[in-house]
């Protein structure tokens, strides 16, 4: 959960407010209480954002872009609060806002710099392209341009491709990494310096498992303590890759503690789930169960991917029948 907005105090009656796209923010302004209060909020010294005087709003000449998006804290004006409540900020709202307050005893002017950030939750994806394997860190909408770093076995990687597409108000970014034939663990970090928000994706490949037909297999999936916070909402998904595409076997939502299972031979241990262990069992294996199994634990702040490769071999009985 993130605050409505946060303030950074800078000199000369100027504050910086950082807001998030489509969220509501407060542009702060205070004055020494007095009668006959007049409040004018303006954008870039040109556009009328909000006017209040003689005890009520006067929005006849308000710039249309602010219509139905602004209000004051009317019960607190008499106590010296001229702050502006600003709904659904967009990147076009970035800039300098001036609050003019006049009373029977004084006039003050405050400047507030509004910066707007975007950080739609990134994702880490594992993809097969022909014979190559790729990890892709991507963020659908981010502003300003983020810092993306990759690590292999905790060592920074200098090679860092970034595919960027810019829309009117934000960037969409993909950062693919070729991991063909690697058994290393990988980590991708995406940082939005304005919102002071960091997301981390971590990929781990487990040793391959060889099983006989009709046996069962246990696949481990436990979050790394560095990232995992059980109080935070997260989702766990187990899926199997077949011919280049993943099909979901089961998933668990921490918010509702719901488990949904799509494969009847799949089982989860409730006791273990309560201990944040999302290891699973797949019973009665058959040859078509061979493949890659992916456990994805995701929250707003991280994605943890664990890959298991399972080889199912025919049992002796089946082999002798053939």
């Amino acid at each position: 959960i993130f605050p409505l907005a946060f303030f950074i105090y800078v000199p000369m009656n100027e504050q910086i407010v950082i807001g998030r796209l489509d969220e509501d923010i407060i542009l702060p302004s205070s004055f020494e209480r007095g009668s006959e209060v007049v409040i004018h909020w303006k954008y870039q010294d040109s556009y009328k954002v909000h006017s209040y005087y003689k005890g009520s709003d006067h929005l006849e000449s308000q710039d249309p872009r602010y219509a139905n998006r602004t209000s004051l804290f009317y019960n607190e004006i008499q106590n010296g609060n001229a702050s502006l409540f600003f709904r659904r900020v967009s990147l076009l709202d970035e800039g300098i806002y001036t609050c003019y307050v006049g009373t029977a005893i004084q006039v003050i002017t405050n400047k507030v710099v509004l910066k707007v950030g975007v950080f739609l939750t990134p994702v880490m994806k594992y993809e097969k392209r022909n014979t190559n394997s790729f990890l892709i860190c991507s963020v659908l909408s981010v502003y300003p341009r983020p810092i993306i770093t990759w690590k292999m076995d905790n060592t920074p990687i200098s090679e860092n491709n970034m595919e960027e597409t810019g829309s009117l108000d934000s960037f969409s970014i993909n950062s693919p990494l070729n991991i063909t034939g690697s058994n290393s663990s990988y980590e991708c970090t995406i940082e939005n310096s304005l919102l002071k928000q960091t997301w981390t994706g971590r990929w781990t490949m487990k040793d391959g498992l060889h099983k006989m037909q009709s046996e069962h297999v246990s696949l481990s999936c436990q979050p790394v303590n560095d990232y995992f916070s059980p109080n935070q909402d997260f989702k766990v998904t187990w899926s199997r890759m077949k011919s280049g595409t993943f099909s979901v076997l089961a998933y668990y939502l921490s918010s509702s503690q719901n488990t949904i299972i799509n494969e009847s031979r799949f089982s989860w241990n409730k006791e273990l789930i309560n201990q944040s262990d999302f290891s699973m069992n797949l019973m009665d294996l058959n040859l078509s169960d061979s493949g890659e199994y992916l456990c994805n634990i995701s929250s707003d702040e991280y994605t943890l991917l664990t890959i298991h490769t399972v080889h199912v071999e025919p049992s002796q009985e089946t082999a002798s029948h053939n």
């Epitope: 009668s35 006959e36 007049v38 303006k42 005087y53 003689k54 000449s61 006049g102 006039v107």
Partner: antibody, heavy 121, light 107 residues
Framework: QVQLVESGGGVVQPGRSLRLSCAAS????????IHWVRQAPGKGLEWVAV????????YYADSVRGRFTISRDNSKNTLSLQMNSLRAEDTAVYYC??????????????WGQGTLVTVSS | DIQMTQSPSTLSASVGDRVTITCRAS??????LAWYQQKPGKAPKLLIY???SLESGVPSRFSGSGSGTEFTLTISSLQPDDLATYYC?????????FGQGTKLEIK
């Protein structure tokens, strides 16, 4: 202390133009709305026009709308009233007066000494 | 426009008297009313704003009251220096309008 000094008054023929000025000092000019108020000889007071602190809003009395234009130069602390198509009934002492704040309140905390405009053929 | 009507037009009173001037608006103006004093040959001076708030530096013998359409200016104890014409003014809405004035004479 707050000072408002009007100038530019004089005798002018009907239909002609005149420009009044008001020089302000002793306060932050760009923080306050300024009005023009006039008073015909031996008569009462009549509000003429207002311009807001930032020049964004201007309002006029019906009797002068379309003929008079109020303007300000915040860098020079001056206010002007351009009066066109003058009529005999525009004869008056013209005062510039400072609003309590931005110009939005509409009453007059400080006044200049006035300048006389006489419209006569 | 909102019409402002003052009464009386002229008032004669003695030093020390309590004097009341009335101002009536043609429609409700809430409390958005100011009173001014103008001495002969001088610019007006603000006495009262928002119907009852005393402007800084104005003697406390001046007071204002009323709201809506009926307002009064009271001088609790008339002084020789109070010889002047008094104007009410509404600032509820454009166009701002003044009363016709009340001329106060000292007996």
């Amino acid at each position: 202390q707050v000072q408002l000094v009007e100038s530019g008054g004089g005798v002018v023929q009907p239909g002609r133009s005149l420009r009044l000025s008001c020089a302000a000092s002793g306060f932050t000019f760009s923080d306050y709305g300024i009005h023009w108020v006039r008073q015909a000889p031996g008569k009462g007071l009549e509000w003429v026009a207002v311009i807001w602190y930032d020049g964004s809003d201007k309002y006029y009395a019906d009797s002068v709308r379309g003929r008079f234009t109020i303007s300000r130069d915040n860098s020079k602390n001056t206010l002007s009233l351009q009066m066109n198509s003058l009529r005999a009934e525009d004869t008056a002492v013209y005062y510039c007066a400072r609003d309590r704040s931005s110009g939005a309140m509409g009453y007059f905390a400080y006044w200049g000494q006035g300048t006389l405009v006489t419209v006569s053929s | 426009d909102i019409q402002m009507t003052q009464s009386p037009s002229t008032l004669s009173a003695s030093v020390g008297d309590r004097v009341t001037i009335t101002c009536r608006a043609s429609q409700s103006i809430s409390s958005w009313l100011a009173w001014y004093q103008q001495k002969p040959g001088k610019a007006p001076k603000l006495l009262i704003y928002k119907a009852s708030s005393l402007e800084s530096g104005v003697p406390s013998r001046f007071s204002g009251s009323g709201s809506g359409t009926e307002f009064t200016l009271t001088i609790s104890s008339l002084q020789p220096d109070d010889l002047a014409t008094y104007y009410c003014q509404q600032y509820n809405s454009y166009s701002y309008t003044f009363g016709q004035g009340t001329k106060l004479e000292i007996k």
